[in-house]
Interface confidence: medium
């Protein structure tokens, strides 16, 4: 069954862009004019979950790659990873829970809360060139992003 997908670039609230630094890691850094096209484009799929006025369940894939952001427990800590999937199976309307994020709109910003691990969010560090990670909104970590629509 066809699944609704939209394409976006994400920047954190410090305007850091997200780039694919090795096959399975996203990093956040400031990009200038000539390397702006390095930032990843996300395919956002609207998937199984519990939508409400302020939360929409989505899955976040990397456009043109068989990679999805997923949340798993590693050494007792919820952890964000890029997971390779079978392109014949994904995306699908009913994704496994580890792929599902609650997209939460706060004013003009957006947050992505793990459906598997409530109150854990896709996060970036204040520092440059650090991996994107799953954080519990503590300290100086950044959980607010802006979304720039990209035509399909």
């Amino acid at each position: 069954v066809p699944i609704r997908q939209l394409h976006y670039r994400l920047r954190d609230e410090q305007q850091k862009s997200l780039v694919l630094s090795d096959p399975y890691e996203l990093k956040a850094l400031h990009l200038n004019g000539q390397n702006i096209n390095q930032q990843v484009i996300f395919s956002m799929s609207f998937v199984q979950g519990e939508p409400s006025n302020d939360k929409i369940p989505v899955a976040l894939g990397l456009k043109g790659k068989n990679l999805y952001l997923s949340c798993v427990m590693k050494d007792g800590t919820p952890t964000l990873q890029l997971e390779s999937v079978d392109p014949k199976q994904y995306p699908k309307k009913k994704m496994e829970k580890r792929f599902v994020f609650n997209k939460i709109e706060v004013k003009s910003k957006v947050e992505f809360e793990s459906a598997e691990f409530p109150n854990w969010y896709i996060s970036t560090s204040q520092a440059e060139h650090k991996p994107v990670f799953l954080g519990n909104n503590s300290g100086q970590d950044i959980i607010d992003f802006t979304m720039e629509s990209v035509s399909s």
């Epitope: 069954v1 066809p2 199984q48 979950g49 519990e50 939508p51 699908k92 009913k94 496994e96 829970k97």
Partner: antibody, heavy 119, light 107 residues
Framework: QVQLQQWGAGLLKPSETLSLTCAVY????????WSWIRQPPGKGLEWIGE???????NYNPSLKSRVTISVDTSRNQFSLSLSSVTAADTAVYYC?????????????WGQGTLVTVSS | QSVLTQPPSVSVSPGQTASITCSGD??????AFWYQQKPGQSPVLVIY???KRPSGIPERFSGSNSGNTATLTISGTQALDEADYYC?????????FGGGTKLTVLG
């Protein structure tokens, strides 16, 4: 209030084609998936398949070769066709709505139609 | 073909807690749903997305799902809870139901 009302032939001979229709009253038709489920007498539930308003379908692999689900959005109706029936297809057949607000699960059901296959 | 396994029957005394399990390979990776069906009636959704309750379903119904097992728990079970209960999950491209559990409220 959403209501699903279903109808169709209740008695079939082996090798005939089962045809059932479900009409949806109340609520939007295009925002949901529409499903068929069956339950043989005294047994459990078996999911047959689903369709959306555009006509896109998913079927249970075990029934896929014999099943067609279609939709008529102008009438807010969807239908089930099951070919080459045998006694094993005797069951109560239910139509149901799959809603995004409950995680695409079956939140409203029709009243059920008993279909008996007998020579 | 994916399989969800439920005990055929569970018995409980009124006021006690009933637990009905549903097991399947990596079921905790998926969302689980539960339906109640009384004789001669259509099924009714009682738990969705592992642990959410639709409006109108009493608070005594709760759910959990991890590992290979989803569990429907009915606390303070009442006579009117006597029914068949079915778990359900999504298997790649189609829905799968468990075989059903008959809940008997004793006395």
């Amino acid at each position: 209030q959403v209501q699903l009302q279903q109808w169709g032939a209740g008695l079939l001979k082996p090798s005939e084609t089962l045809s059932l229709t479900c009409a949806v009253y109340g609520g939007s038709f295009s925002d949901y998936y529409w499903s068929w489920i069956r339950q043989p007498p005294g047994k459990g539930l078996e999911w047959i398949g689903e369709i959306d308003h555009s006509g896109s379908t998913n079927y249970n692999p075990s029934l896929k070769s014999r099943v067609t689900i279609s939709v008529d959005t102008s009438r807010n109706q969807f239908s089930l066709s099951l070919s080459s029936v045998t006694a094993a297809d005797t069951a109560v057949y239910y139509c149901a709505r799959a809603s995004p607000s409950s995680g695409w699960t079956l939140d409203y059901w029709g009243q059920g139609t008993l279909v008996t296959v007998s020579s | 073909q994916s399989v969800l396994t439920q005990p055929p029957s569970v018995s409980v005394s009124p006021g006690q807690t009933a637990s009905i399990t549903c097991s399947g390979d990596k079921l905790g990776d998926k969302f689980a749903f539960w339906y109640q069906q009384k004789p001669g009636q259509s099924p009714v959704l009682v738990i969705y997305l592992d642990n959410k309750r639709p409006s109108g379903i009493p608070e005594r119904f709760s759910g959990s799902n991890s590992g290979n097992t989803a569990t429907l728990t009915i606390s303070g079970t009442q006579a009117l809870d006597e029914a068949d209960y079915y778990c359900q999950a999504w298997a790649d491209s189609f829905e799968v139901f468990g075989g059903g559990t008959k809940l008997t409220v004793l006395g």
